[in-house]
């Protein structure tokens, strides 16, 4: 039947049998670092170039027999998923294969590094159009592997990798943990994370998105017309490499940051059953399944934002956690979250010429996360305005006072170990949209930005009695840039953005015996760029 | 995805000793670090990626590799330079005894050294 995976990545408004993708990735070269491939398979014949690159370790075991069809099975299948005639995602994309995995599917970090260098050298010798590098492999966390990926990404190459099949935190593996790499987890036809024997897809904050990765039909190296179904995060990564090739064919000038934001934007949201993930990983793992954009879509006018979680700070008293945006992204807001509720807030800092989001643990806390809201906004110029603790009952307030600057995010940070309940409750003054308000004992930080045509508005949702979760979402056409809690009472665990929704989490009320005075409000800052909208209208 | 926060083993060697009286030995107190895979069965001891500091001139990779070989030979160790990196990271891949790590970490321009490890099809 129509492969479920191709149906799943079809844009929502189309039926799979009606959708004919544009160009099919023909302007893009996809490099595949894997086993050998059977280049004369009907599915990929004529669209694959087998390079002379080979850097593989010896096979284990004295009785191992090299059998061509077995040696090439993994790579052949993935090549078919990326650009196969019948079952491929980007049917027009060209492929170049480098052999870095032996017949047992095993390679080395060093061999793969040499492969990445080969690609960079080829790019320097003969610059072509956009390049996508597919790394359907994983090893333990490697500083050098991640560093090499960072360098290649900064040279304009899009790297896509498998999250790993270890049912574990993807941050413990490379290249999955490299921030510049697009890391892909695997889901099945039921939108469940894929189980593989006793293991399964990796998860966590190092995963960018998920894609189909179970029972994926693709070319088999058993014969030139055979197909097999295989499962794994490699198959998922191959889908995203194909989607990336399609997007880059439609818009060859896209940067890595723009491509990643588009992949996230066009993904199906909140369809994965998160119960499969360990409880502590659910909030960190993106609930996104990759999909192709609608064929005519040039999304340049959109204000794109994504949420980036830091590593956990650890439990020491002065521990901090730092979340960073990618090179071409702007950090528009910063929030924090602690499962124990013991934290001392967060603030935006400058580090190496870039803004970062730093969260602070509190005494007795189990640790914190910093959460950055990272956006694509051309010609943006941002600054942070800080108000020290007011000490007054009305709370601490700060606003954007520079002309043309709008409020994109509010953060609060406090030195006291326990902020306590704010009485009377902090209220936002009406008619002052460019103002952050917070607890009287906290410093309040306003992220104020100027960009052509940028407009923002504050949207609040308050609940009189405490709730475990309070949410507020931005309307269509507006993008969530900031998410914070008001007033930041002692039972607030933190705030974070999920897609276009601001989530404020509090203690389970039944266990804490909080009073009804401790109201919680979620504060969303929603922005759009009139400049980008106008530019898109002029294009049309 | 935070690079520096990965859960891997890091062995930091503080280098305060003079190495063979080399004129361009690292300045007092400079440290290079050694990394290896946290998953023991995936380790490949005996092969190491020596990564030089970012601003290192490309000619330094060969020079540092030759210096390592010479100093190792003086101690009776054979080493083999398997690859010199130029286009992504300054550095080189070397096959050598783990006994030489302390020596290699003291070489000028060295940022860190990582033991090779396995990767697997997913």
């Amino acid at each position: 039947s129509i492969p479920w995976n191709l149906e799943r990545i079809t844009p929502a408004r189309y039926r799979a049998d009606e959708y004919q993708p544009p160009k099919g990735g023909s302007l893009v070269e996809v490099y595949l670092l894997d086993t050998g491939i059977q280049s004369d398979h009907r599915e990929i014949e004529g669209r694959v170039m087998v390079t002379d690159f080979e850097s593989v370790p010896e096979e284990d075991g004295t009785r191992f027999h090299r059998q061509a069809s077995k040696c090439d099975s993994h790579g052949t299948h993935l090549a078919g998923v990326v650009s196969g005639r019948d079952a491929g995602v980007a049917k027009g994309a060209g492929l170049r294969s480098l052999r870095v995995l032996n017949c047992q599917g095993k390679g080395t970090v060093s061999g793969t590094l040499i492969g990445l260098e080969f690609i960079r050298k080829s790019q320097l010798v003969q610059p072509v159009g956009p390049l996508v590098v597919l790394l359907p492999l994983a090893g333990g966390y490697s500083r050098v592997f991640n560093a090499a990926c960072q360098r290649l990404a900064r040279a304009g190459v899009v790297l896509v990798t498998a999250a790993g099949n270890f049912r574990d935190d993807a941050c413990l593996y490379s290249p999955a943990s490299a921030p510049e790499v697009i890391t892909v987890g695997a889901t099945n036809a039921q939108d469940q994370p894929v189980t593989l024997g006793t293991l399964g897809t990796n998860f966590g904050r190092c995963v960018d998105l998920f894609a189909p990765g179970e029972d994926i039909i693709g070319a088999s190296s058993d014969c030139s017309t055979c197909f097999v179904s295989r499962s794994g995060t490699s198959q998922a990564a191959a889908h995203v490499a194909g989607i990336a090739a399609m997007m880059l064919s439609a818009e060859p000038e896209l940067t890595l940051a723009e491509l990643r934001q588009r992949l996230i934007h066009f993904s199906a949201k909140d369809v994965i059953n998160e119960a499969w993930f360990p409880e502590d990983q659910r909030v960190l793992t993106p609930n996104l399944v990759a999909a192709l954009p609608p064929s005519t879509h040039r999304a340049g006018w959109q204000l794109f934002c994504r949420t980036v979680w830091s590593a956990h700070s650890g439990p020491t008293r002065m521990a901090t956690a730092v979340a960073r945006c990618a090179q071409d992204e702007e950090l528009l807001s910063c929030s924090s979250f602690s499962r124990s509720g013991k934290r001392r807030g967060e603030r935006i800092e400058a580090q190496g010429g870039k803004r970062v989001c730093r969260a602070h643990n509190a005494f007795g806390g189990e640790g914190v996360y910093a959460i950055a809201r990272c956006c694509l906004l051309p010609q943006v110029n941002c600054s942070v305005h800080t108000a020290p603790p007011a000490g007054a009952s009305m709370g601490t307030r700060v606003h954007c006072h520079q002309q043309g600057h709008v409020l994109t995010g509010c953060s609060s940070h406090w030195e006291v170990e326990d902020l306590g309940t704010h009485k009377p409750p902090v209220l936002r003054p009406r008619g002052q949209p460019n103002q952050c308000v917070g607890h009287r004992e906290a410093s309040i930080h306003a992220s104020c930005c100027h960009a052509p045509g940028l407009e923002c508005k504050v949207k609040e949702h308050g609940i009189p009695a405490p709730q475990e979760q309070v949410i507020v979402a931005c309307e269509d056409g507006w993008t969530l840039t900031g998410c914070s809690a008001l007033p930041g009472t002692s039972h607030v665990l933190g705030a974070y953005a999920v897609d276009n929704t601001c989530v404020v989490r509090s203690w389970d009320v039944s266990t804490t015996g909080s009073t009804s005075e401790e109201a919680v409000a979620a504060v969303a800052i929603c922005c759009r760029s009139r400049h980008l909208v106008q530019a898109s209208q002029e294009l049309q | 995805q935070e690079d520096e926060d990965g859960d891997y083993e890091e062995l930091v060697l503080a280098l305060r000793s003079e190495e063979d009286g080399l004129a361009d030995a690292p300045e007092h107190g400079a440290t290079a670090t050694f990394h290896r895979c946290a998953k023991d069965p995936w380790r490949l001891p005996g092969t190491y990626v020596v990564v030089l500091k970012e601003e290192t001139h490309r000619s330094q990779s060969e020079r540092t590799a030759r210096r390592l070989q010479a100093q190792a030979a003086r101690r009776g160790y054979l080493t083999k330079i398997l690859h010199v990196f130029h286009h992504l990271l300054p550095g080189f891949l070397v096959k050598m005894s783990g006994d030489l790590l302390e020596l290699a970490l003291k070489l000028p321009h060295v940022d860190y050294i990582e033991e090779d490890s396995s990767v697997f099809a997913q």
Partner: antibody
Amino acid sequence: EVQLVESGGGLVQPGGSLRLSCAASGFTFNNYAMNWVRQAPGKGLDWVSTISGSGGTTNYADSVKGRFIISRDSSKHTLYLQMNSLRAEDTAVYYCAKDSNWGNFDLWGRGTLVTVSS
Amino acid sequence: DIVMTQSPDSLAVSLGERATINCKSSQSVLYRSNNRNFLGWYQQKPGQPPNLLIYWASTRESGVPDRFSGSGSGTDFTLTISSLQAEDVAVYYCQQYYTTPYTFGQGTKLEIK
């Protein structure tokens, strides 16, 4: 040798149960979807059920939904069909068929006869 | 469900002559993404299981003699045996595998005249 061998057929009373097995050999079992197709005496072919290579996805014909369960054991390279609440109209030769992975059947077993009668 | 209708129900053809069997689907089985018709043809000889002859409406399965050919697209398909041999006596079925439930035609019995 690439082959499929069915077993487990026989005579059963209406309302009874039966479990069919299909032993696969000569190919990588978990790389292929598998199917059960039946043929009533003197009649045409009737698809019953399919299971994906991983076992994660199953589909059934409306006539057997809720009564039959398809499953597979990749360690034993065996496909199963658990048939419950059997009716007279389930009487047929049941074939196990390997899927090309597109939905057509490129390898068939010789079949096992199931007779539902009182 | 997609209904498959074959014609004729039975057919008698002389040895060496051409035999043509038609199959019509109640909706298109053409998948635009790869331009393939999800239609197969099977041969079933008495006392034997079916055997795949043609897939993708026109691609011969390996080992199938080249006198068998398939054609058609969308909803109308044809199986042709260019020169009938004695061993071709069988019942022939078309099958759509575009979507589940997979459905077969009622079969066409081919005999020698």
